[in-house]
């Protein structure tokens, strides 16, 4: 099952998956001036069997100068916070990465790919956070987030990480985001936490579509 939302945003931190669970999709995005080849894949998909996982489909970009008669499709980007910038894309896997069953490595780059990689994560995916350059980590627990399924809804656990500027003191004036607190203690998968944070409200709502109509006469 796809995770419906983005991993939590931590100020002055970026996240990275060290491995991608089977079922993860990566959009085939091309850099400016390029587009997917006609009838090319929209996405790469991490698939596998009990012994080996790999990325299905190949992303291919071609120059936009050669136009097709029908408009070329652009895959749907995620929101900015779910994107991974190029600096996060180097294969920084730990040594035991290859042996992690049911997971794919970071896919190799393709020619003229976009500067940001857009992933669609699945339940069970773990991402790791680190403070950006110039900030240091104050840990109050694991600096990671896991996409979990609870009561039929997906949600990401809150990483216990605060990134502070080098010049700042370690004294905090109680500005911690309220959404961090539910994750501060162990929780049972059967208990339902209802909080008023945007994230919880988002995940408790069922996705719906409503269609309506307006008509206009041509003058």
């Amino acid at each position: 099952e796809l995770c419906d939302d983005d991993p939590p945003e931590i100020p002055h931190a970026t996240f990275k998956a060290m491995a991608y669970k089977e079922g993860t999709m990566l959009n085939c995005e091309c850099k400016r001036g390029f587009r997917r080849i006609k009838s090319g894949s929209l996405y790469m998909l991490c698939t596998g069997n009990s012994s080996h996982s790999s990325w299905d489909n190949q992303c291919q970009c071609t120059s936009s100068a050669t136009r097709n008669t029908t408009k070329q499709v652009t895959p749907q980007p995620e929101e900015q916070k779910e994107r991974k910038t190029t600096e996060m894309q180097s294969p920084m896997q730990p040594v035991d990465q290859a042996s992690l069953p049911g997971h794919c490595r970071e896919p190799p780059p393709w020619e003229n790919e976009a500067t940001e990689r857009i992933y669609h994560f699945v339940v069970g995916q773990m991402v790791y956070y680190q403070c950006v350059q110039g900030y240091r980590a104050l840990h109050r627990g694991p600096a990671e987030s896991v996409c979990k399924m609870t009561h039929g809804k997906t949600r990401w656990t809150q990483p216990q990480l605060i990134c502070t500027g080098e010049m700042e003191t370690s004294q905090f004036p109680g500005e911690e985001k309220p959404q961090a607190s539910p994750e501060g203690r162990p929780e049972s998968e059967t208990s339902c936490l209802v909080t008023t944070t945007d994230f919880q409200i988002q995940t408790e709502m069922a996705a719906t579509m409503e269609t309506s109509i307006f008509t206009t006469e041509y003058q």
Epitope: D4, S41, N57, Q76, P77, A206
Partner: antibody
Framework: PGASVKVSCKAS????????MNWVRQAPGQGLEWMGG????????TYAQGSTGRFVFSSDTSVSTAYLQISSLKPEDTAVYYC???????????WGQGTTVTVSS | WTQSPDTLSVSPGDGATLSCRAS??????VAWYQQRPGQAPRLLIY???TRAAGVPARFSGSGSGTEFTLTISSLQSDDFAVYYC?????????FGQGTKAEIK
């Protein structure tokens, strides 16, 4: 015939800009036909081969709504028009209830 | 992208098998939908064999490459509907023409 119609599709319960929105139509007694979709993040539309010209897809992220505009309506445009959230390999998992457009003189 | 049969006459409680054939290999990139009269389609299966959330276990999908099957193990009264397959490999998305499951 000749008029214009704008069908709206309001999404709720998820981040609107995370997924593309498809438009699918179904003529009376017929099957499902993919008309195309819109990248809700960039507003970039894509049209199926038979949907170019009189059909325009647009979206407004501030109200989490996608739109389908049909101009110069013809009797053969009579159909139920559905919007559906596009999750690629994972299919169209959430559908609107459909809007019936009837073109008659 | 061919779906068969066009119509399937089944007695309640019996099983049913619906087929879809792609003209070229699309691995497991197939979704199945159910559409009851007067309603919007509903996603049943994605990735050829994974049931969508809330779909009863009597629905199962199988296949890979060019041949795909939707199996309903024991038809209940509200399973009598039209079923569509769709390739989810790349745009343009394409649907099968539909299979109507009717009461025998």
């Amino acid at each position: 015939p000749g008029a214009s119609v704008k069908v709206s599709c309001k999404a709720s319960g998820y981040t609107f800009t995370t997924y593309a929105m498809n438009w699918v139509r179904q003529a009376p007694g017929q099957g499902l036909e993919w008309m195309g979709g819109i990248n809700t993040n960039t507003g970039d539309p894509t049209y199926a081969q038979g949907s170019t010209g009189r059909f325009v897809f647009s979206s407004d992220t501030s109200v989490s709504t996608a739109y389908l505009q049909i101009s110069s309506l013809k009797p053969e445009d009579t159909a139920v028009y559905y919007c559906a959230r596009d999750r690629f390999h994972y299919g169209m998992d959430v559908w609107g209830q459909g809007t019936t457009v009837t073109v008659s003189s | 992208w061919t779906q068969s049969p066009d119509t399937l006459s089944v007695s309640p409680g019996d099983g049913a098998t619906l087929s879809c054939r792609a003209s070229e290999g699309i691995r497991t990139s197939v979704a199945w939908y159910q559409q009851r009269p007067g309603q919007a389609p509903r996603l049943l299966i994605y990735g050829a064999s994974t049931r969508a959330a809330g779909v009863p276990a009597r629905f199962s999908g199988s296949g890979s490459g060019t041949e795909f099957t939707l199996t309903i193990s024991s038809l209940q009264s509200d399973d009598f509907a039209v079923y569509y397959c769709q390739q989810t490999h790349t745009w343009p998305w394409t649907f099968g023409q539909g299979t109507k499951a009717e009461i025998k």
